[in-house]
């Protein structure tokens, strides 16, 4: 038993039929001595008394909100929550594994720059009685200090006859160097809670592999005279970390007919212009990626060529 | 090129080669993703490679102040990567394949530390770790290891060089 | 503590009705509240709830044929666009507290809604 | 989500013992409870947290199970215990709510 945080205590159970679970002693949090009674949850059922219990806690049934009163007046409580070890391995039943980039990942990160600042989200198809914490570090035998703010709920998708709901979180490194390499990896934890469930997910990234640029912005089209071709220019992303001159980005130019099926044309630079062929119908887009080091290409910026 | 009097490099040069060296060790270990080399415990390995950390001076400013910190430590990297690339690692089993790009990768690690301390000038340099792993899917490992590291220890050489290129140029 | 629904009655089809439920005894702002319906003779069925802090949550055949609002002290269950399939008797429940999604110790007795033209 | 009951109906003497079942089609852990119904009134619950008797409720109802697998034993039966039970998930409203089908119980 390990305490999550003040009064919330999180009981690690081995978790197969007919287990004998986990013995804990729970001690009231007052100087009185006696007359002391327990009860759980809502329930007026005495459990003991004493200024301490001693409970064998081997379901959720088990696990709950344990309060200890005197004469009518509630003393302190203790909130006990359950972590299920099944053959071995941690539960991870409230979130879905989102099996990208590979299977068992829970927690997807993504960074628009080098400044550390990044993004992590996570889904899950339970709607109430949630609660997420998130910490994170660079390191983790000597971590440096990552602030993440509180997770929110950024976005609901009805798949099927369920609901699927995104929870995001915003982090920054505090001593964050964009231009040195990153030597120790980032450390992200989520303590999440569902009822008396806890369960905890990690993931553990270089801020350069999780980077995915905005789409490049300002994309326009300038036919150049007597001729099918046209100059395409765009701008670098804002969110993108300065200067260009040493944060460089590389582009790819696709003409698209209306057809998916249609040949795609690609052209790639790392100027912020380029001369292709515009097609009755067809749109161009553009998109960037760190010129240096291949982590994920930005979403596509369009224009359509009419 | 850097003497290490303090004269400035060939910065398009090494800008040009830089660059080819992002292109070829991408192409040495494309598969971005193919393990979490972080899962597979990271031993002496890698924790022994030169990185390019902040107080180097390869940022902007630090270019601008006083590139020669900055060339130093990438030239450091540069031959260290050389040395492992050319040790029993690459050359012992499992063979790499005859067009393994990991030979024009070891070829223009030392072009580009050459252009950066030509014969006669010497900066120091870090000592190989001793790794001689006995099993082949260890040695295969350890390339994997390797080279993702080498991918983020060019990537910032290639943008300190761009960077140079652009602004400290003569 | 207790809950009592009201409201119910022989509406034409497409004629929208407010069932409501009465607390008394307990507040809203710390109880989650349910409406279940029963068809003659058929099981229990829920249509929604409406937590402490007034957010509804609905079943997935609902879509958006009934509303859940609360006052202080009244739970009201809207059906828009009442059809014969809608004849039910509706109960209204208070859940335990302890969570949104919960179970439910204190119903009241029903209200009968008849729907026929 | 589903949430099934067998039987249906079942019938059973005075002072004998009956068992209803109920499987989720998913984990719900322990979040099940069980009412009771008799023709023309509400239902009352009689057990939540898959085991725990609510207040005033005999202790010849006894609730067991967890995951997907539940039951409801009433042992020692009586004449008033005729009546419809119900079970109960009360996991997630999105994600594992909603009631079984009933089971009839005829006490002879």
């Known amino acids: 038993i390990w305490e999550l945080k003040k009064d919330v205590y999180v009981v690690e159970l081995d978790w197969y039929p007919d287990a004998p679970g986990e013995m804990v002693v729970l001690t009231c949090d007052t100087p009185e001595e006696d007359g002391i009674t327990w009860t759980l949850d809502q329930s007026s059922e005495v459990l003991g008394s004493g200024k301490t219990l001693t409970i064998q806690v081997k379901e959720f049934g088990d696990a709950g909100q344990y309060t200890c009163h005197k004469g009518g007046e509630v003393l302190s409580h203790s909130l006990l929550l359950l972590h299920k070890k099944e053959d071995g391995i941690w539960s991870t039943d409230i979130l879905k594994d989102q099996k990208e980039p590979k299977n068992k990942t829970f927690l997807r990160c993504e960074a628009k720059n080098y400044s550390g600042r990044f993004t992590c989200w996570w889904l899950t198809t339970i709607s109430t009685d949630l609660t997420f914490s998130v910490k994170s570090s660079r390191g983790s035998s000597d971590p440096q200090g990552v602030t993440c703010g509180a997770a929110t709920l950024s976005a609901e998708r009805v798949r099927g006859d369920n609901k699927e709901y995104e929870y995001s979180v915003e982090c920054q490194e505090d001593s964050a160097c964009p231009a040195a390499e990153e030597s120790l990896p980032i450390e992200v934890m989520v303590d999440a809670v569902h009822k008396l469930k806890y369960e905890n997910y990690t993931s553990s990234f270089f801020i350069r592999d999780i980077i995915k640029p905005d789409p490049p912005k300002n994309l326009q089209l300038k036919p150049l005279k007597n001729s099918r071709q046209v100059e395409v220019s765009w701008e670098y992303p804002d969110t993108w970390s300065t200067p260009h001159s040493y944060f460089s980005l590389t582009f790819c130019v696709q003409v698209q007919g209306k057809s998916k099926r249609e040949k795609k044309d690609r052209v790639f630079t790392d100027k912020t212009s380029a001369t292709v062929i515009c097609r009755k119908n067809a749109s161009i887009s553009v998109r960037a990626q760190d010129r240096y080091y291949s982590s994920s290409w930005s979403e596509w910026a369009s224009v359509p060529c009419s | 090129r850097a003497v290490p009097g303090g004269s400035s490099p060939a910065w398009t040069q090494c800008q040009q080669l830089s660059q080819k060296l992002c292109t070829l060790a991408w192409s040495a270990h494309p598969l971005v993703g193919h393990m979490d080399l972080r899962e597979e415990g990271d031993e002496e390995t890698t924790n022994d490679v030169p990185h390019i950390q902040c107080g180097d001076g390869c940022d902007p400013q630090g270019l601008r102040d006083n590139s020669q910190f900055c060339l130093q430590r990438i030239h450091q990297g540069l031959i260290f990567y050389e040395k492992l690339l050319g040790s029993d690692i690459f050359t012992g089993e499992p063979s790499l394949l005859p067009d393994s790009p990991v030979g024009q990768l070891h070829a223009s690690l030392l072009g580009l530390s050459q252009l950066l301390q030509p014969e006669g000038h010497h900066w120091e340099t870090q000592q190989i770790p001793s790794l001689s792993p006995s099993q082949p899917w260890q040695r295969l490992l350890l390339r994997f290891k390797i080279l993702r590291s080498l991918q983020a220890f060019v990537a910032v050489a290639a943008r300190v060089f761009a960077h140079g290129a652009a602004t400290l140029s003569p | 503590q207790s809950v009592e629904e009201s409201g119910g009655r022989l509406v034409t089809p497409g004629t929208p009705l407010t069932l409501t439920c009465a607390v008394s005894g307990f507040s809203l702002s710390d109880y989650t509240m349910i409406w279940v319906r029963q068809a003659p003779g058929e099981g229990l069925e829920w249509i929604g709830i409406?937590?402490?802090?007034?957010n509804t949550y609905y079943a997935t055949w609902v879509k958006g044929r009934f509303t859940i609002s609360k006052t202080s002290t009244t739970v009201d269950l809207k059906m828009i666009s009442p059809t014969t399939e809608d004849t039910a008797t509706y109960f209204c429940a208070r859940g335990s507290g302890a969570y949104i999604s919960d179970y439910f110790n204190v119903w009241g007795p029903g209200t009968l809604v008849t729907v026929s033209s | 989500f589903e949430l099934t009951q067998t039987p249906s109906s079942v019938e059973a003497a005075v002072e004998g013992t009956v068992t209803i079942k109920c499987q989720a089609s998913q984990s719900i852990d322990s979040w099940l409870s069980w009412y009771q119904q008799k023709p023309g009134q509400p239902p009352k619950l009689l057990i939540y947290a898959a085991s725990k008797l609510a207040t005033g409720v005999p202790s010849r109802f006894s609730g067991s199970g967890s995951g997907t697998q539940f039951t409801l034993t009433i042992g020692d039966l009586e004449c008033a215990d005729a009546a419809t039970y119900y079970c109960?998930?009360?996991?997630?409203?999105?994600?594992?709510?909603?009631f079984g089908g009933g089971t009839e119980v005829v006490v002879v």
């Open positions: 409406i937590s402490s802090s007034g």
């Open positions: 109960q998930s009360y996991y997630d409203v999105n994600a594992g709510y909603g």
